[in-house]
């Protein structure tokens, strides 16, 4: 998402249609407190960031309240009065849904239904990944709502589960971010376990889909 303007690289993340985080990496200005100026309406005056992110004591980003805005962020990163990067972006391109909350498991013989609280906006996919110590890779199933039934499980095996939310690519475009994974939960014979024996440490989720 970065730009070539004066060697400034930017990253935008729109957290759950609530908060926008814009971070920058500008090697030329590594010891400079760049300022961030923004507006959500092209006709308004720019406001300056009031919630900076710092790296090694210097500004490296800004957090903005942007709740439920399907709209454009106009922004300018400046060195004093000199703009070093100026852009306007549709924020939804950079959506990152929040991690699933209130994850529950309902077992019935060789199947489990995983549910969680649906987010307040649509066009999302709720993905459950699971594996047993005997599986070399995570298995995956996803649905349009957080109600995912996985069948064909072996009641004697211990399974690890985790859940995340992804923005539908056909709606939000391909450059969004999946949510963070929920915590891993381990189950065997319909009962929760502290861990599954010999389960490798789950891989960290990739930002790309």
């Amino acid at each position: 998402q970065g730009g070539a303007a004066e060697g400034v690289q930017i990253q935008i993340i729109y957290f759950n249609l609530e908060t926008v985080q814009v971070t920058w990496n500008a090697s030329k200005y590594s010891r400079t407190n760049l300022t961030f100026h923004y507006r959500f309406n092209g006709d308004e005056a720019y406001d300056q960031c009031t919630n900076y992110l710092l790296q090694e004591g210097h500004t490296s980003g800004c957090l903005l309240d942007a709740e439920q805005r399907d709209d454009i962020l106009y922004f300018s990163i400046r060195n004093g009065t000199h703009p070093v990067f100026t852009a306007s972006r549709w924020m939804v391109y950079y959506l990152k849904p929040s991690s699933p909350k209130h994850v529950r498991f309902s077992w019935h013989q060789d199947a489990v239904t995983v549910t969680c609280s649906d987010l307040s906006y649509g066009d999302l996919l709720y993905e459950v990944q699971y594996r047993s110590p005997f599986d070399t890779e995570w298995q995956s199933k996803q649905e349009n709502t957080c109600n995912v039934t996985i069948e064909g499980l072996d009641a004697e095996k211990c399974y690890s589960f985790w859940v995340r939310v992804k923005a539908m690519e056909d709606v939000y475009g391909p450059d969004t971010y999946p949510s963070d994974w929920s915590e891993v939960t381990c189950w065997q014979r319909g009962e929760i376990r502290d861990a599954c024996a010999e389960t490798p440490t789950p891989p960290k989720p990739k930002l790309s889909k």
Epitope: Q1, A5, A87, R89, V92, Y93, Y172, G173, D175
Partner: antibody
Amino acid sequence: QVQLQESGPGLVKPSQTLSLTCTVSGFSITTSGYYWSWIRQHPGKGLEWIGYIGYNSKTYYSPSLKSRVTISRDTSKNQFSLKLSSVTAADTAVYYCARSLYGGYKDAFDSWGQGTLVTVSS
Amino acid sequence: DIQMTQSPSSLSASVGDRVTITCRASQSIGTSLHWYQHRPGETPKLLIKFASRSISGVPSRFSGSGSGTDFTLTISSLQPEDFATYYCQQSPGFPPTFGQGTKLEIK
């Protein structure tokens, strides 16, 4: 199959207002998620986006033309319209109406009209 | 505005040739880059969306690649109906902007 057709005068006098209408058939302009655009092409030049009107009637205009542009719609006729005021010879162009693909919100233009040439001249 | 620069601006090729057109954005746009074909007297036609995603009804000889600032449209084996002008367009930046076009002519 969605079809778009531009209509309006082919000749406009300088300082007057250019008015064009796009009639959409085979698809409702109020369908959620879709945006409807005007795009123009100056003779021998590339394409220039003018503005959108959304399924929810929200409008967005190109900053360079914003002070002169109005896009509106008539849902009963399934039409949307462009008004460009205070025209000069520099507004002479082929004007296209187009639909934005539902994806990434307001992305690629997947259906276009044939285009209509508007000449600004006295 | 994000500037889109296409190269070459014109290109002569023969039926059966493999042709590549490039598009460069002045700022990174991820993969939100779309390609169009415009034949004289016809409506512009969407060929590729989001850098590499095919569009239903578009022949498989058209393919796209790239991300960030550099993108490519490839026609694997030119057909007579492919001689046209091709445009790229970015969408995450506002306003949407197009390249200046690449005119593909018969050699």
